[in-house]
Every structure is written in structure tokens, then in C-alpha cells.
Interface confidence: low
């Protein structure tokens, strides 16, 4: 077995008792912040599981990969990573599991090379609309972000602001059209009940979209038409009942798409006929032979691909005089 990721003998490690001095002077080339491990050869700094309450001020200018996972950061203020000279090479920033509940406007400003950002497993009760765009202009400077990982960022019910969590996240994704170059977006495990209809149209470069393990019931108002580069769409472990003709046609029209639909409670009644027909013909659904009915009870566990039109009936609607309670 190899050794664990969290301790690195090949990294130079700052002594825990050294205070990280805030200074206008640029850090020394080989300086490593207290409670961090640094490797100039790998251009990597790891400050992992150290209960840090703020981003170290004395990050080395060479850092390309920065791991700040498993800390207690709470808030990322504007310019949290702004340094003089700037962290011009920082390309991958992982802040997962650091108890962030607030990310303010401009938190990631002055990171000209930032390609990958992971904020997963933080209870983000307050994500500024301008967290990623940096400004409130209607059209912001393009963000360099290519991959944005926002899995399990939903806060506990009692910590949510009195507003739609979906709406808060989407506002940050769309502000200033800054994320036009985004290629990978992961939004798994966020209890999303719906996907605001305008979000995908404004992220035209997406290659990979992960919406798995949410609570999406329907895609009726979601358009995939503009996502001509989309390669994978993950919709596993949601609450989808059926995909309607418009959605099916849009998915079929995407040239590189692979769709993942496992573990949804498909309702196998007359409304499912179009989807069953499409599943039998399409090559875009991965593992389509595993899709099974959840409802009605008589259809439970039936394989969708094995159904025919005679199986897919809707109970007749009784006139009011014949209805029973």
C-alpha cells in the first residue's frame, strides 16, 4: 500500500510554532506557511486538516496546486488570495471540507491562472452572486475557471437564508457571464429540487455536468440545446419520474453526449411511452438496461427496456360521481 495523502515526507514542512507573519514584503522563494507542507518541485502547497481559520498570508509565489482542505475557514473575504506579487501560477485550488459558510464577492480575484476550484463539502449558506465574477458589472472580465466543483455545498435546513438555495448558486454561476469558459461543473448532492431554466444556456462550453444525488423531479423547463460540447450528464440518484419528448430530442441532438440516469423513481404509466421508445433506440444513455420502474406498484422493478406500449397504461379518470375517497 502507498502512504496517505495527508502527510508528505517529500514536502518541506513549517514548524507548527512558527507564526505566519503578515508582511508587505514578498515571501522568500522557499518559505512555507506555518502548518503547511510545501514542495517547490511539485509546485504544491498542502495545508490539510490543520483547523486553519484563515487563508495563510505567506503562500509561496510558485504555488500551482493549493490544498486547503479540512480546515475551519468560515468566511472567504474579497481578495482572500490577493497577494503582492500575485499568485500568478495558482491553477488548482481545493477548499473542500473547510467549514466555509460564506464566500464573498471577489473572493477569487487576482488569480489569473485559476482553472480548477473545489468548494465541495462546505455548508455555503451565503454564496455571493459575485463570488466567481468578482464584480457586479453586467458583463465581467472572463473568469479563467474551467472546472468548478460544488458538490454537497447545501447548508443544513436551519442555516439556510430565507431564499432559494438553487437560485443563490445559479446567480453566482451566471453573474457577469464570467463563466462562459467553464467546461466541468459538479453540483452533486445539493438537494436541488429544480434547475433554473436559464442556467445551462449561459454555460455554453460545458463538457461535463454532474447533477447526481439531488432531488430533481423534472427537466421539463431545462434546455440542453445550446450545450453542443456536452460529453457527460449525470442525473443519477434524483427524483425523476419521466423524461418528456422535448428533453429526449434535445439530448439526442447533442453530438458527444453520454447520459447517466440510474436510481431514479421512474413512473411507468402512459406518459412513459415516448421515453421507453427512445431508450430502445438511443445509444446516449449509459447503463440503460439497469433502469427500472418504481411506480405504479404493479410495475415496480420492471426493466424499462423490456416494456411495451400495452404495459404503459394510465388508470382512467373517473367522473366525479364515481370517485371514491
Amino acid at each position: 500500500s502507498s502512504s496517505p495523502t495527508s502527510s508528505a515526507s517529500s514536502f518541506s514542512s513549517s514548524a507548527p510554532f512558527l507564526a505566519s507573519a503578515v508582511s508587505a514584503q514578498p515571501p522568500l522563494p522557499d518559505q512555507c506557511p506555518a502548518l503547511c507542507e510545501c514542495s517547490e518541485a511539485a509546485r504544491t502547497v498542502k495545508c490539510v486538516n490543520r483547523n486553519l481559520t484563515e487563508v495563510p498570508t505567506d503562500l509561496p509565489a510558485y504555488v500551482r496546486n493549493l490544498f486547503l482542505t479540512g480546515n475551519q475557514l468560515a468566511v472567504l473575504p474579497a481578495g482572500a488570495f490577493a497577494r503582492r506579487p500575485p499568485l500568478a501560477e495558482l491553477a488548482a485550488l481545493n477548499l473542500s471540507g473547510s467549514r466555509l459558510d460564506e464566500v464573498r464577492a471577489g473572493a477569487f480575484e487576482h488569480l489569473p491562472s485559476l482553472r480548477q476550484l473545489d468548494l465541495s463539502h462546505n455548508p455555503l449558506a451565503d454564496l455571493s452572486p459575485f463570488a466567481f465574477s468578482g464584480s457586479n458589472a453586467s458583463v465581467s472580465a472572463p473568469s479563467p475557471l474551467v472546472e468548478l466543483i460544488l458538490n454537497h455545498i447545501v447548508p443544513p435546513e436551519d442555516e439556510r437564508q430565507n431564499r432559494s438555495f438553487e437560485g443563490m448558486v445559479v446567480a453566482a454561476l451566471l453573474a457577469g457571464r464570467a463563466l462562459q469558459g467553464l467546461r466541468r461543473l459538479e453540483l452533486a448532492s445539493n438537494h436541488f429540487l429544480y434547475l433554473p431554466r436559464d442556467v445551462l444556456a449561459q454555460l455554453p462550453s460545458l463538457r461535463h455536468l454532474d447533477l447526481s444525488n439531488n432531488s430533481l423531479v423534472s427537466l421539463t423547463y431545462v434546455s440542453f440545446r445550446n450545450l453542443t460540447h456536452l460529453e457527460s450528464l449525470h442525473l443519477e440518484d434524483n427524483a425523476l419520474k419521466v423524461l418528456h419528448n422535448g428533453t429526449l430530442a434535445e439530448l439526442q441532438g447533442l453530438p458527444h453526449i453520454r447520459v447517466f440516469l440510474d436510481n431514479n423513481p421512474w413512473v411507468c404509466d402512459c406518459h412513459m411511452a415516448d421515453m421507453v421508445t427512445w431508450l430502445k433506440e438511443t445509444e446516449v444513455v449509459q447503463g440503460k438496461d439497469r433502469l427500472t420502474c418504481a411506480y405504479p406498484e404493479k410495475m415496480r422493478n420492471r426493466v424499462l427496456l423490456e416494456l411495451n406500449s400495452a404495459d404503459l397504461d394510465c388508470d382512467p379518470i373517473l367522473p366525479p360521481s364515481l370517485q371514491t375517497s
Epitope: 495523502t5 473545489d118 466543483i149 457527460s232
Partner: antibody, heavy 121, light 107 residues
Framework: EVQLLESGGGLVQPGGSLRLSCAAS????????MSWVRRAPGKGLEWVSA????????YYADSVKGRFTISRDNSKNTLYLQMNSLRAEDTAVYYC??????????????WGQGTLVTVSS | DIQMTQSPSSLSASVGDRVTITCRAS??????LNWYQEKPGKAPKLLIY???SLQSGVPSRFSGSGSGTDFTLTISSLQPEDFATYYC?????????FGQGTKLEIK
């Protein structure tokens, strides 16, 4: 200490079936995606299959799709690979490995020692 | 699926040499590229993850670079224990393919 221990390998005839197991310990099993990788005699490593931490998502190499099934029992901290319709070209040492990070931004940081599967008449 | 092509397939070198192995992806994979070392009868071992990050416990003579489609594993000064087979692996696509391997032998 993280440990992965494969079992279930052996000699089987073409067309036969075998189930491999991988017992995991030393970490929170359900939090990690897991994978099976194999190395055939004289060949390189081949990624075979992977499964998400919850077991809700599974992935297969084209060479095994429809014949192999990956699964996991998180209550038993065990990963499985059910291999059906085995062929001579499935002969290999099979390793189970743990993914560190999400499936799409991951690397295999711990590996078992492997179990040998031989398909021959 | 994303194809990974390593070069060279085999390589002879001496202790103390600087060695470079390259890996090319059939499409851009950002920095989702890992390097593993395998020795006969042993389990593979992670060396480099995310293209350039050194795994814990791996000697600093190993380094990785590259992004997009072209990646490099460099061993700055070969040691006797480094003679092994090296593999790259992409985790950008939903199927995580390996390169065919580069066997590093003693000259």
C-alpha cells in the same frame, strides 16, 4: 492503517463465473469511490470498473461491459466484482484500489496485493 | 473513450541518469493525469497525482508536469529501486484509462 484485501480468484473454465471480493479496513469505506484494475500476463494495467461511494454510479471498461458487475456492501466494508461469461483474455491479476477525491478528480492512493484469475479449459 | 499513449515503451538507463517519460492523451484532459509505478509481484504505487503533485512518501527526484494533452514524468537521478514499469492514467473521462506502460530497465 488502510488495508485492501482481495479474494475469490482461481481457475475457471471459459464461459464460467467468479466473484471477487475486496475487504477494506482503516478508513470510512462509504466515503470513497472504489475500482478494479487488472494486469494480464505480459500486458499493462487495464482499468476495469469503478463504483461511487454510495454505490449509485457504476462504470465499466468496454471490454467487460455486460459481463462484469461491480457492487459494494458498505455495511460490510466490502467491494465485489461479479465476473460472468469469462474468456481466456480475462486471465489476469485483479487489484482493488481506493479512489482519493471525487471520481472525476481522483487518483488511486491505496491498492490491494491482487488476486489471480485464470480462465482456461 | 480517451486513449493514453506513452513513450517510449521501454527505456534502458543507468543509475544517476535523468529520465523522462511522456504521456499523450487523445483529447484534452486538463490536469487529471496520474502516474503509477509497478514492480513485478507488487501492487502498483501512486507517484504523482493531478499531473504535478507528488504523493506522500514518494522521493522528490520524481516530478510530473504538463496539462491538456501532453504530460511528462521525470526522474532526476535514477536510483536502483526505480527500475520498474511506469503508467499514466487519466481520470478526466468517465472511464479511467491507463497508458500502455513504459518499462525502465538497467543499461
Amino acid at each position: 492503517e488502510v488495508q485492501l484485501l482481495e479474494s475469490g480468484g482461481g481457475l475457471v473454465q471459459p464461459g464460467g463465473s467468479l466473484r471477487l471480493s475486496c475487504a477494506a479496513s482503516g478508513f470510512t469505506f462509504s466515503s470513497y469511490a472504489m475500482s478494479w484494475v487488472r494486469r494480464a500476463p505480459g500486458k499493462g494495467l487495464e482499468w476495469v470498473s469503478a463504483i461511487s461511494g454510495s454505490g449509485g454510479s457504476t462504470y465499466y471498461a468496454d471490454s467487460v461491459k455486460g459481463r462484469f458487475t461491480i457492487s459494494r456492501d458498505n455495511s460490510k466494508n466490502t467491494l465485489y466484482l461479479q465476473m460472468n461469461s469469462l474468456r481466456a483474455e480475462d486471465t489476469a491479476v485483479y487489484y482493488c484500489a481506493r479512489y482519493y477525491g471525487g471520481y472525476y478528480s481522483a487518483w488511486m492512493d491505496y491498492w490491494g496485493q491482487g488476486t489471480l484469475v485464470t480462465v482456461s479449459s | 473513450d480517451i486513449q493514453m499513449t506513452q513513450s517510449p515503451s521501454s527505456l534502458s538507463a543507468s543509475v544517476g541518469d535523468r529520465v523522462t517519460i511522456t504521456c499523450r492523451a487523445s483529447q484534452s484532459i486538463s490536469s487529471y493525469l496520474n502516474w503509477y509505478q509497478e514492480k513485478p509481484g507488487k501492487a502498483p504505487k501512486l507517484l504523482i497525482y493531478a499531473a504535478s503533485s507528488l504523493q506522500s512518501g514518494v522521493p522528490s527526484r520524481f516530478s510530473g508536469s504538463g496539462s491538456g494533452t501532453d504530460f511528462t514524468l521525470t526522474i532526476s537521478s535514477l536510483q536502483p529501486e526505480d527500475f520498474a514499469t511506469y503508467y499514466c492514467q487519466q481520470t478526466y473521462g468517465y472511464l479511467h484509462t491507463f497508458g500502455q506502460g513504459t518499462k525502465l530497465e538497467i543499461k
